[in-house]
């Protein structure tokens, strides 16, 4: 189902962008990118 | 003192479940990422996952559906559920902040 | 995956020693960690970002390299960096991959 793929796709991006602030704070220490609370 | 303390190990039948508690002191964590990182006996470090400022957690895939990370920030504690235990989850389970300050580690023992 | 080299070293103090750490792919950002680890304890952070160093961590020690290949090197070792040593890549699909570790025992 097409909606089915769209939201995997987009689960997929966000857990890759949230991953690329992670390894950035962690093994980059780069504080400024940390995510706030929501 | 700043530290992290992890709790809830001990032995588990397999298929059980254990949760285990990471609580903070000397330091609010409200603003880290949290990670949890576990070892077998005799072996190397295995990540299993992180929980951010917002409470969206993410994980390693092997993983992801057993293992659940949550956080209680009024309570500064971070916390790693885990379901349907295997033998090959015998380790010592860390948590830490960022990855620069680390608990002492629990030890989770699934044997019957 | 990251696969470290050797997988034991022994050395006496004074003695220089450099760790390998190769990456199937490239690791993402540079974000390469390195980790010492004694037993029963946890591990403790030495550098970040593939070659610098953690607050407090002395100063022989020192990391290299980029892409796929990463080196650790202490310069001269002391009795207290007997230790198993771990690097740590960034992974944006699995987020961090540890390698095997490096056991550094004394000769």
């Known amino acids: 189902h097409s909606d089915g793929i769209f939201t995997d796709s987009y689960s997929r991006y966000r857990k890759q962008m949230a991953v690329k602030k992670y390894l950035a704070a962690v093994l980059g220490k780069r504080y400024k990118q940390r995510v706030k609370n929501k | 003192e700043v530290q992290l303390v992890e709790s809830g190990g001990g032995l588990v039948q397999p298929g059980g479940s254990l949760r285990l508690s990471c609580a903070a002191s000397?330091?609010?964590?409200?603003?880290?990422?949290m990670t949890w990182v576990r070892q077998a006996p005799g072996k190397g470090l295995e990540w299993i996952g992180f929980?951010?400022?917002?409470?969206?957690?993410y994980y390693a895939s092997w993983a992801k559906g057993r293992f659940t990370i949550s956080r209680d920030n009024s309570k500064n504690t971070v916390y790693l559920q885990m379901n349907s235990l295997r033998a090959e989850d015998t380790a010592v389970y860390f948590c830490?902040?960022?990855?620069?300050?680390w608990g002492q580690g629990t030890l989770v023992t699934v044997s019957s | 995956q990251l696969t470290q080299s050797p997988s034991t070293l022994s050395a006496s103090v004074g003695d220089r020693v450099t760790i390998t750490c190769q990456s199937s792919?490239?690791?993402?950002?540079?974000?390469l960690a390195w980790f010492q680890q004694k037993p029963g304890k946890a591990p403790k952070f030495l550098i970040y970002?593939?070659?610098k160093l953690e607050s407090g961590v002395p100063s022989r020690f020192s990391g290299s390299g980029s892409g796929t290949e990463f080196t650790l090197t202490i310069s001269s070792l002391q009795p207290d960096d007997f230790a198993t040593y771990y690097c740590?890549?960034?992974?944006?699909?699995?987020?961090?991959?540890f390698g095997g570790g490096t056991k550094v025992e004394i000769k």
């Open positions: 830490a902040r960022d990855l620069d300050l």
């Open positions: 000397g330091i609010d964590l409200n603003s880290y990422y």
């Open positions: 929980i951010d400022a917002g409470g969206d957690a």
């Open positions: 792919e490239s690791v993402y950002g540079n974000y």
């Open positions: 970002e593939a070659s």
């Open positions: 740590a890549g960034g992974d944006i699909s699995e987020g961090v991959a």
